[in-house]
């Protein structure tokens, strides 16, 4: 039988087959953000470098205007790291003044937007209280998981405070996705 | 037509095909480090277990002398976790003494070395200020992302202070990569 | 030759081939835990949502009674994030009282259970001292790596203190695995 050499020994045929090298993939890296006014209680989205340095998009995975566009339905692994940096958090100042001690926090959310659905879906969230004693602090939040996405879905990364994002190096803050 | 059952319904043929099981893969685990002299401003590289316990290399992905050797070009997912542990950081001692309050830090870098290029390329960095109040502290830094690598590239993990790396358990500190 | 278009140009045939879409995959999300009695020095396992919202299991990857069941041997990428939250840790109270300063900690372990082997195997551990100054603290621990698993292996996520796990949102605490 022709083509039989492709079938596992128990004669089960898996379909469809495709080369791994042609799957949609992207790795985006940080640039200095251009902050704009955003709605209260709505975290601003980051924008990204998609061509230079370590960044790339391939096989119909496109980046436009803060969004990664999903070109075909399937299961994707999605990841992001955001490195935050700041001065002593307000929390420690409040503590010293003896006032109520609500910690500051840093949050990263990977969000899915589907045109047919009015509300964005939060896929992944990393959130951390920041109550640092030192005068300058910095730390990363990393996220990654697998999700079933549909063609046309859009992915973005939102953060609690865009001014705290470390934009200095492409290896510190990044965002990526690939079809499994 | 024989073999047609492998083609997606829209008749697009993807090539080349390959079995997933023969892709280069490695998961390396921590061993106690033998600190060596390293240049100022250059973070030392960790060495790893590549055979025993949870560690393995397969399908031409080889480990030698602190490096994972990339046997074929393609897109790889690369990851590492380093668990650090230490005594109260200098930062808090400095703080108590009323001196300038520059925080200590812990840093992990996944680095690519290409023989044709003299300088290593930092692919991923996780860096965190450490200004702990407790007498003993411990915490992990996790990194993972996808990169386009070339046959012959070498990967290593560098850390800011090798003496702070927790080498006690293979599940706490590790390094891996696999071809997508 | 029919089917030859699937073979790479150098005539090497990779086998067995299979479609990516039929590989075992799961992404599980947090639910409120029902704490049970567990042995001292043994971390309790989390149970998970496996169908609703972002959660799914597919292609013979099944979830039952806190375990993900591995349906076929191979290399799997396994990941989890657990977000912890708590009140001021005991550590700071101890510190204020001038007693020895042993920090509290939070720990996540991804564990493999093999029926033929009496002891569970710890695959991944993320552990962090918690010595927070603020009154309320919260933070995630993320883990992910690749492991060679056997058909019939079972995976679970254990935590140091089930009462500190943030169960409020499916994007904060999750557990997943997929065959590479």
């Amino acid at each position: 039988l022709k083509g039989q050499e492709f079938a596992p020994s128990h004669q089960q045929v898996y379909a469809p087959l495709r080369a791994d090298g042609d799957k949609p993939r992207a790795h985006l890296t940080v640039v200095r953000q251009t902050p704009t006014q955003h709605f209260k209680n709505q975290f601003p989205a980051l924008h990204w470098e998609h061509e230079l340095g370590l960044a790339f998009t391939k096989n119909r995975m496109n980046y436009t205007n803060k969004f990664l566009l999903i070109p075909e339905s399937g299961d994707y692994f999605i990841y992001s790291q955001v490195t935050f940096r700041g001065m002593t958090s307000e929390c420690s100042e409040i503590r010293q003044a003896g006032r109520p001690n609500k910690p500051d926090s840093i949050t990263v959310v990977i969000t899915k937007v589907t045109d047919s659905y009015p509300e964005p879906t939060q896929l992944l969230m990393g959130t951390k209280s920041v109550c640092e004693v030192g005068s300058n602090w910095f730390q990363p939040i990393y996220l990654g998981a697998m999700f079933s996405l549909q063609e046309g879905d859009k992915l973005m990364v939102n953060v609690s405070d865009i001014s705290l994002v470390d934009y200095t190096k492409e290896d510190k803050t990044f965002f990526g996705a690939f079809l499994l | 037509l024989k073999g047609q059952e492998f083609a997606p319904s829209h008749q697009q043929v993807y090539a080349p095909l390959r079995a997933d099981g023969d892709k280069p893969r490695a998961h390396l685990t921590v061993v106690r480090q033998t600190p060596t002299q390293h240049f100022k401003n250059q973070f030392p590289a960790l060495h790893w277990e590549h055979e025993l316990g949870l560690a393995f290399t397969k399908n031409r992905m080889n480990y030698t002398n602190k490096f994972l050797l990339i046997p074929e070009s393609g897109d790889y997912f690369i990851y590492s976790q380093v668990t650090f542990r230490g005594m109260t950081s200098e930062c808090s001692e400095i703080r108590q003494a009323g001196r300038p309050n520059k925080p200590d830090s812990i840093t992990v870098v996944i680095t690519k070395v290409t023989d044709s290029y003299p300088e290593p390329t930092q692919l991923l960095m996780g860096t965190k200020s450490v200004c702990e109040v407790g007498s003993n502290w411990f915490q992990p830094i996790y990194l993972g992302a996808m990169f386009s690598l070339q046959e012959g590239d070498k990967l290593m993990v560098n850390v800011s202070d090798i003496s702070l790396v927790d080498y006690t358990k293979e599940d706490k500190t590790f390094f891996g990569a696999f071809l997508l | 030759l029919k089917g030859q278009e699937f073979a790479p140009s150098h005539q090497q045939v990779y086998a067995p081939l299979r479609a990516d879409g039929d590989k075992p995959r799961a992404h599980l999300t947090v639910v409120r835990q029902t704490p049970t009695q567990h042995f001292k020095n043994q971390f309790p396992a989390l149970h998970w949502e496996h169908e609703l919202g972002l959660a799914f299991t597919k292609n013979r990857m099944n979830y039952t009674n806190k375990f993900l069941l591995i349906p076929e041997s191979g290399d799997y990428f396994i990941y989890s994030q657990v977000t912890f939250r708590g009140m001021t840790s005991e550590c700071s109270e101890i510190r204020q009282a001038g007693r020895p300063n042993k920090p509290d900690s939070i720990t996540v372990v991804i564990t493999k259970v093999t029926d033929s082997y009496p002891e569970p195997t710890q695959l991944l551990m993320g552990t962090k001292s918690v010595c927070e100054v603020g009154s309320n603290w919260f933070q995630p621990i993320y883990l992910g790596a690749m492991f060679s698993l056997q058909e019939g292996d079972k995976l679970m996520v254990n935590v140091s203190d089930i009462s500190l796990v943030d169960y409020t949102k499916e994007d904060k605490t999750f557990f997943g695995a997929f065959l590479l």
Epitope: G53, T168, K169 | - | -
Partner: antibody
């Protein structure tokens, strides 16, 4: 692909003003800071300032404060640099440059020669 | 006021290795990365090296950058006649909130 196309050469008299435009294409205009850099004949590069095309916020080098104004029109993805009270030593090629990774100026316009002569 | 100092000129013969230095007068900016630009006569500068030592795709691997402390350098190995150009280093100056350029180095291939 990213392109920055600048307006043509200008000849101005001392005391006059000049406005140079920079039309961007191939990327989201509002997502990246736009800088202006000038180069006098036979001299090196001199940074003048940047504009945030999203908010319109600006930051000018101290040397040019009070004389330079950077604006943008997002509807046509164009940035502008206006320099007033021109002097002969303002004769230079003026470049717009888009900021990118590592806060580097990753894409540059072709340059606009401004000649100030009485 | 911070200053980046480059030698005004450098030269070499084809095939040689040439190094251009860039030193920072103010250690306050020593923590920020150095970028390098190449400019041919009559054309706009071109992005050459970023983050001290990284090359954008399309830049030949004959070009390499390095940085130690407050001093950076650009090395060109296997010098070619088409490398004759002006080379500028730059770093982000937090006080300026903008890039600070070196004075430039004119490279001549003899």
């Amino acid at each position: 692909q990213v392109q920055l196309v600048q307006s043509g050469a200008e000849v101005k008299k001392p005391g006059a003003s000049v406005r140079v435009s920079c039309k961007a294409s191939g990327y989201t205009f509002t997502g990246f800071y736009m800088h202006w850099v000038r180069q006098a004949p036979g001299q090196g590069l001199e940074w003048m300032g940047w504009i945030n095309p999203d908010s319109g916020g600006t930051n000018y080098a101290q040397k040019f404060q009070g004389r330079v104004t950077m604006t943008r029109d997002t509807s046509i993805s164009t940035a502008y640099m206006e320099l007033s009270r021109l002097r002969s030593d303002d004769t230079a090629v003026y470049y717009c440059a888009r900021e990118g990774i590592a806060v580097a100026l990753t894409y540059w316009g072709q340059g606009t020669l401004v000649t100030v002569s009485s | 006021q911070s200053v980046l100092t480059q030698p005004p000129s450098a030269s070499g013969t084809p095939g040689q290795r040439v190094t251009i230095s860039c030193s920072e007068s103010n250690s306050d900016i020593g923590t920020n990365a150095v970028n390098w630009y190449q400019q041919f006569p009559g054309t706009a500068p071109k992005f050459l090296i970023y983050s001290n030592n990284k090359r954008p795709s399309g830049v030949p691997d004959r070009f390499s950058g390095s940085k130690s402390g407050t001093s950076a350098s650009l090395a060109i190995s296997g010098l070619q006649s088409e490398d004759e150009a002006d080379y500028y280093c730059a770093t982000w100056d937090d006080n300026l909130n903008g890039p600070l350029f070196g004075g430039g180095t004119k490279l001549t291939v003899l």
